[in-house]
Interface confidence: low
């Protein structure tokens, strides 16, 4: 079943390569377990950036080596992606799945274009 997912159109990463955005979904049911996946689309290639399954009211738990962190509040997920460089500029799509209880719902956002600008190197001082 389709579910509406909203996310910002554009986000600019910080000079430290950190980008944050909110992924909000219109939950048609009372889910107790939700899975959030961030996908990156660039040059028509889609790759999974990170994914987390969480219980409603609990923290998102990404894998230890994940570049993502996040928190949830109601039907909103606040996602932060770290370690970004200019080459990581692309469309980051939020995919939300209501895992339990049945029925299963799937929602895919339109994507957030994250722009990453590598910081200028500091000039050498005399």
């Amino acid at each position: 079943k389709a579910m509406h997912v909203a996310q910002p159109a554009v986000v600019l990463a910080s000079s430290r390569g950190i980008a944050s955005f909110v992924c909000e979904y219109a939950s048609p049911g009372k889910a107790t377990e939700v899975r959030v996946t961030v996908l990156r689309q660039a040059d028509s290639q889609v790759t999974e950036v990170c994914a987390a399954t969480y219980m409603m009211g609990n923290e998102l738990t990404f894998l230890d080596d994940s570049i993502c962190t996040g928190t949830s509040s109601g039907n909103q997920v606040n996602l932060t992606i770290q370690g970004l460089r200019a080459m990581d500029t692309g469309l980051y799509i939020c995919k939300v799945e209501l895992m339990y209880p049945p029925p299963y719902y799937l929602g895919i956002g339109n994507g957030t274009q994250i722009y990453v600008i590598d910081p200028e190197p500091c000039p050498d001082s005399d």
Epitope: T53, P102, Y104
Partner: antibody
Framework: QVQLVQSGAEVKKPGSSVKVSCKAS????????IHWVRQAPGQGLEWIGQ???????YYNPSLKSRVTITADKSTSTAYMELSSLRSEDTAVYYC????????????WGQGTLVTVSS | DIQLTQSPSSLSASVGDRVTITCRAS???????LAWYQQKPGKAPKLLIY???TLQSGVPSRFSGSGSGTDFTLTISSLQPEDFATYYC?????????FGQGTKVEIK
């Protein structure tokens, strides 16, 4: 290829507990839920419960007070423990895989016969 | 809980026959959340059809599923010797997941 291999048959006394294992291979354990289903002799199928790779579990209310489902991700093994056994728990216990996005079971273990008898 | 009632409970048929099994739900179940399984004696069930009408990979095309709401049907267009088994419907729309009581297809 995808396989779910269960532990061997058990004979138990009423009031005791049984723990059945289900070792998964041929797929990424973390991408799926493992369910447990039982079938009493000559009877139909009864869903017991499930565990996600996250460790969260959900149970059939009819068995919730007596069943515990766990998983060891390091060995891709799921476990189902049923306590306070009674004769009506005599059944073949199956583990089965369902993918995210559905609860239809595309692969099943071979089954484990648990006999409860005094 | 959603109760699933299959009919008939058992049937006798010959090789080549067209066989129809019905599964009736106690409340409406969207097509997406209904599956059919085949089980042979001493074996685990095998997924035949999911989402009411989608054939699982590797399942012969003589099996088909249809229906919506509370009434679903499994049809075997031309019964083969290996099709003599028990068939179960399953709903996964509401928890707990439930199965029909089964329909045994026997050789006439």
């Amino acid at each position: 290829q995808v396989q779910l291999v269960q532990s061997g048959a058990e004979v138990k006394k009423p009031g005791s507990s049984v723990k059945v294992s289900c070792k998964a291979s041929g797929f990424t354990f973390s991408g799926y839920a493992i369910h447990w289903v039982r079938q009493a002799p000559g009877q139909g199928l009864e869903w017991i419960g499930q565990i996600y790779h996250s460790g969260s579990t959900y149970y059939n209310p009819s068995l919730k007070s007596r069943v515990t489902i766990t998983a060891d991700k390091s060995t891709s093994t799921a476990y189902m423990e049923l306590s306070s056994l009674r004769s009506e728990d005599t059944a073949v216990y199956y583990c089965a895989r369902s993918g995210y996005g559905g609860y239809d079971f595309d692969y099943w273990g071979q089954g484990t016969l648990v006999t409860v008898s005094s | 809980d959603i109760q699933l009632t299959q009919s008939p409970s058992s049937l006798s048929a010959s090789v080549g026959d067209r066989v129809t099994i019905t599964c009736r739900a106690s409340q409406s179940v969207p097509r997406r959340y209904l599956a059919w399984y085949q089980q042979k004696p001493g074996k685990a069930p095998k997924l035949l059809i999911y989402a009411a009408s989608t054939l699982q990979s590797g399942v012969p095309s003589r099996f088909s599923g249809s229906g919506s709401g509370t009434d679903f049907t499994l049809t075997i267009s031309s019964l083969q010797p290996e099709d003599f088994a028990t068939y179960y419907c399953q709903q996964y729309y509401r928890s707990p997941i439930t199965f029909g009581q089964g329909t045994k297809v026997e050789i006439k």
